[in-house]
């Protein structure tokens, strides 16, 4: 970058090279060029010569003043006009940055995705800082009082093998950058309470011709968790409002869920599950589309329409559900 150039003098920023966005700042340039009493000192920002708010301090130094500086990054350099030199002489350069101190991290969440072998912790970092901001995730065993720290710039995956201090932990997040430091509230977790079952996937759909045609959705999960609660939401693709069916599920078999739908309409289905009574849900599965037939023939939609696996298990019990309505968006 600009900071690697050979300098004939120096350039500095007040209050600092990294400063709060919207501040008034001063950039100083001091020439130290052999056999040159600078006639003028010029400033450049991102290669564009600055015209206004330049004040000469003394024979070798000038100041460039910016009001309400809002650019996240800029490369500054300055030059001198030396008598008897045809071209400007480079003095020095500096990269400057503006941004914000971090907000207090909130909504700290830690989950263990089944089979992942990791505890994944995320948080709401708050407003964009624009500058390099690091996060330290503190994990403290409530049983052994041992604390581990993990440095990251976003979320963190912590191997469950490294969580040797029992089942109960306190987790909190510290955010820090050049402009400040903030710490989240502590989250208390129990490892058994934060497991999210293996992803539920819709594999196929079929509409069966009967007095009242019905659509059967086939779906499954590889979870080994016994007590699982699931939701399936569906709507016509032209609608805004989702309908939601709730299920208490045993994934010994591929699930079959029945729906009585309007003919000749394209529907979208999604499913998600959680360990019964626990806090965290899976994200909604990827959308599965099925168009109901106009009238008689049997129509089947298969999972090849998107990247999902088909379990190959035999179809067994039909799960029954309770129809509810929900305005949740995607």
């Amino acid at each position: 970058g600009i900071t690697n150039i050979n300098c004939s003098g120096h350039i500095w920023v007040e209050p600092a090279t990294i400063f709060k966005m919207g501040m008034n700042i001063s950039i100083y340039c001091q020439a130290a060029i052999k056999n040159c009493q600078p006639r003028k000192l010029h400033f450049y920002k991102n290669g564009i010569k600055e015209r206004f708010q330049i004040t000469r301090i003394n024979k070798t130094t000038a100041r460039l003043w910016y009001k309400n500086f809002l650019e996240p990054h800029a490369s500054m350099y300055c030059t001198a006009e030396c008598p008897k030199h045809f071209q400007e002489t480079l003095i020095c350069g500096k990269d400057i940055s503006s941004g914000y101190p971090p907000d207090i991290p909130d909504e700290v969440t830690c989950v263990i995705y089944e089979y992942s072998g990791n505890m994944t912790c995320t948080w709401n970092a708050g407003k964009l800082t624009y500058i390099d901001t690091k996060y330290v995730v503190h994990v403290k065993s409530l049983e052994t009082e041992e604390e581990q720290q993990y440095l990251t710039s976003s979320y963190i995956n912590i191997s469950t093998d490294s969580l040797q201090g029992g089942k109960k932990y306190l987790v909190w997040v510290q955010a820090a950058n050049a402009l400040g430091m903030e710490e989240s509230k502590q989250l208390q977790i129990h490892l058994d309470d934060i497991v999210i079952p293996s992803a539920a996937v819709i594999s196929r759909a079929e509409t069966i011709n009967a007095t009242v045609p019905k659509t059967i959705i086939y779906w499954d999960s590889q979870t080994t968790i016994e007590k699982v609660s699931c939701e399936m939401r569906y709507k016509a693709t032209t609608n805004q409002t989702w309908n939601v069916k709730e299920f208490d599920t045993n994934f010994t078999y591929v699930q079959q869920s029945e729906f009585y739908l309007e003919p000749n309409i394209k529907y979208v289905f999604q499913v998600r599950c959680q360990e019964t009574g626990k806090r965290y849900w899976q994200p909604w599965s990827s959308p599965f589309f099925h168009k109901t037939p106009e009238t008689v023939p049997q129509v089947t939609s298969k999972a090849f329409q998107h990247d999902t696996w088909n379990s190959g298990l035999t179809v067994a019990s039909i799960s029954t559900g309770h129809l509810t309505s929900d305005n949740r968006g995607d």
């Epitope: 006639r39 003028k40 564009i48 206004f52 000469r56 006009e81 008598p83």
Partner: antibody, heavy 119, light 107 residues
Framework: QVQLVESGGGVVQPGRSLRLSCAAS????????MSWVRQAPGKGLDLVAD??????????YYADSVKDRFTISRDNSKNTLYLQMNSLRAEDTAVYYC??????????WGQGTLVTVSS | DIQMTQSPSSLSASVGDRVTITCRAS??????LAWYQQKPGKAPKLLIY???SLQDGVPSRFSGSGSGTDYTLTISSLQPEDFATYYC?????????FGQGTKVEIK
């Protein structure tokens, strides 16, 4: 050689508008700053408006007395400088010179165009 | 903005005289000073830039000197064509600013 030819001056009523032009030749137009300097009858020289060179990203400057009324612009494809003067006042009466600067002193000047604001 | 004060505002001199006009800046302008000559009904003409550099085509009887805040234009031997008004201009800090002018008249 460098030539600057102003046009567009004349007599205009207070509150009306006028547009001055300056046709330039004999130099690399967009590498130079261009200015309008005026001289009221029997008075000294005053910088009215300035539009800088390409290296300054064509930054503009206006004297306080003309801010929000005058607009300086340049058409580098036509080597022409303009001054759009709106809401003219009696005190805007002057000879308006187009001037060229590569450093910040004015190296070359046009012959001037007289603007008279009178009812 | 930097203020430029020229003196005298006018002077009377004879052909052959040595004439000196001074210009004082409100702060150090580091030799960023130019001198112009203007004849009635004509555009200003650049005589000197960088306080002491003579513009091409300008007679050598014109010279400039000075540093800091004080600058001088000297005409070593006044010629009939030199009767005109002279202006200084600082271009050390933007915007450039003119002195109020010195009128050189025939005595």
């Amino acid at each position: 050689q460098v030539q600057l030819v102003e046009s567009g001056g004349g007599v205009v009523q207070p509150g009306r508008s006028l547009r001055l032009s300056c046709a330039a030749s004999g130099f690399d137009f967009d590498s130079y700053g261009m200015s309008w300097v005026r001289q009221a009858p029997g008075k000294g020289l005053d910088l009215v408006a300035d539009i800088n060179s390409k290296s300054y990203n064509y930054a503009t400057y206006y004297a306080d007395s003309v801010k929000d009324r005058f607009t300086i612009s340049r058409d580098n494809s036509k080597n022409t400088l303009y001054l759009q003067m709106n809401s003219l006042r009696a005190e805007d009466t002057a000879v308006y010179y187009c001037a060229v600067h590569h450093s910040d002193y004015f190296e070359y000047w046009g012959q001037g165009t007289l603007v008279t604001v009178s009812s | 903005d930097i203020q430029m004060t020229q003196s005298p505002s006018s002077l009377s001199a004879s052909v052959g005289d040595r004439v000196t006009i001074t210009c004082r800046a409100s702060q150090d302008i580091y030799t960023n000073l130019a001198w112009y000559q203007q004849k009635p009904g004509k555009a200003p003409k650049l005589l000197i830039y960088h306080a002491s550099s003579l513009q091409d085509g300008v007679p050598s009887r014109f010279s400039g000197s000075g540093s800091g805040t004080d600058y001088t234009l000297t005409i070593s031997s006044l010629q009939p064509e030199d009767f005109a008004t002279y202006y200084c201009l600082q271009d050390s800090e933007y915007p450039p600013t003119f002195g109020q002018g010195t009128k050189v008249e025939i005595k």
